[in-house]
């Protein structure tokens, strides 16, 4: 079948990195600069992806493979093949259309991306708060009072005072 196909279609003999040039009697011509063909038998080469601005080049384009981009520091990749770059925030913040904003009281974010999430409610598991939460860290739940040995006491630190200027977004 392969032999039959190549007799019928000379383009099938063109390897990756070339294209079947109709203007030159279907001769296999190398892909022009800034273009590539990743499979054989192609009638055109694809334009290389350009990594500029918010994108930077992770892998250069070659005649047989497209360029690969990642994001300039300060931003991180989103989507398949890093199709978008999204701004980093500090821990204790989340990204909004107004830029990076501090987590509201009672929420935290321990990463440079993603949203602020509510602190764990220790009492739902019958436990007490061992370490208070912050904008950057979740609370740490301790053992429930019932788990404590007789005579021991559970010291629950007071809840932190509401910080000024951290009204809900």
């Amino acid at each position: 079948f392969e032999r039959t196909r190549s007799l019928q279609d000379p383009c099938s003999n063109c390897p990756a990195g070339t294209f079947c040039d109709n203007n030159r009697n279907q001769i296999c011509s190398p892909c022009p600069p800034n273009s590539f063909s990743s499979a054989g038998g192609q009638r055109t080469c694809d334009i290389c992806r350009q990594c500029k601005g918010v994108f930077r080049t992770r892998k250069e384009c070659s005649s047989t493979s497209n360029a690969e981009c990642d994001c300039t520091p300060g931003f991180h990749c989103l989507g398949a093949g890093c199709s978008m770059c999204e701004q980093d925030c500090k821990q204790g913040q989340e990204l909004t259309k107004k830029g990076c904003k501090d987590c509201c009281f009672g929420t935290f974010n321990d990463q440079k991306r993603g949203i602020c999430r509510p602190w764990t409610n220790c009492s739902l598991d019958g436990k007490s708060v061992l370490v208070n939460g912050t904008k950057e860290r979740d609370v740490v739940c301790g053992p429930s009072p019932a788990d404590l040995s007789p005579g021991a006491s559970s010291v629950t630190p007071p809840a932190p005072a509401r910080e000024p200027g951290h009204s809900p977004q």
Epitope: F75, L78, M84, E86, T96, K97
Partner: nanobody
């Protein structure tokens, strides 16, 4: 081909003004949120401002509030950044960038940006 081309950068004295422009081609500007971001020498990329499709929403990083104004002319497929009261710390390469499909709903990712225009603030 989808393209953004910035212009208008240059050397300006502290306290001076500049207006950056960004010409969009290959897509309809009025369908997208648009952004300006900048990269100071030796620093990471910093988001500066954004504007929604019809220009009714505009947001700025704290350090430029009251000094920079983002605007757009959808009929001319152009985005602008008016910069006044410029400071040495505004020295950077400025890029315009398109908010990707779903910007402001699912994410705040930028999917297209230009080559940038250089702004130098120095006496």
């Amino acid at each position: 081909e989808v393209q953004l081309v910035e212009s208008g950068g240059g050397l300006v004295q502290p306290g001076g003004s500049l207006r950056l422009s960004c010409a969009a081609s290959g897509f309809t500007l009025s369908n997208y949120w648009m952004n300006w971001v900048r990269q100071a020498p030796g620093k990471g990329l910093e988001w500066v401002a954004n504007i929604n499709q019809d220009g009714s929403e505009r947001y700025y990083v704290d350090s430029v509030k009251g000094r920079f104004t983002i605007s757009r002319d959808n009929a001319k497929n152009s985005l602008y950044l008016q910069m006044s009261s410029l400071r040495a710390e505004d020295t950077a390469v400025y890029f315009c960038a398109r908010g990707g499909e779903g910007y402001g709903v699912d994410h705040y990712g930028l999917d297209v940006s230009g080559q940038g225009t250089t702004v130098t603030v120095s006496s």
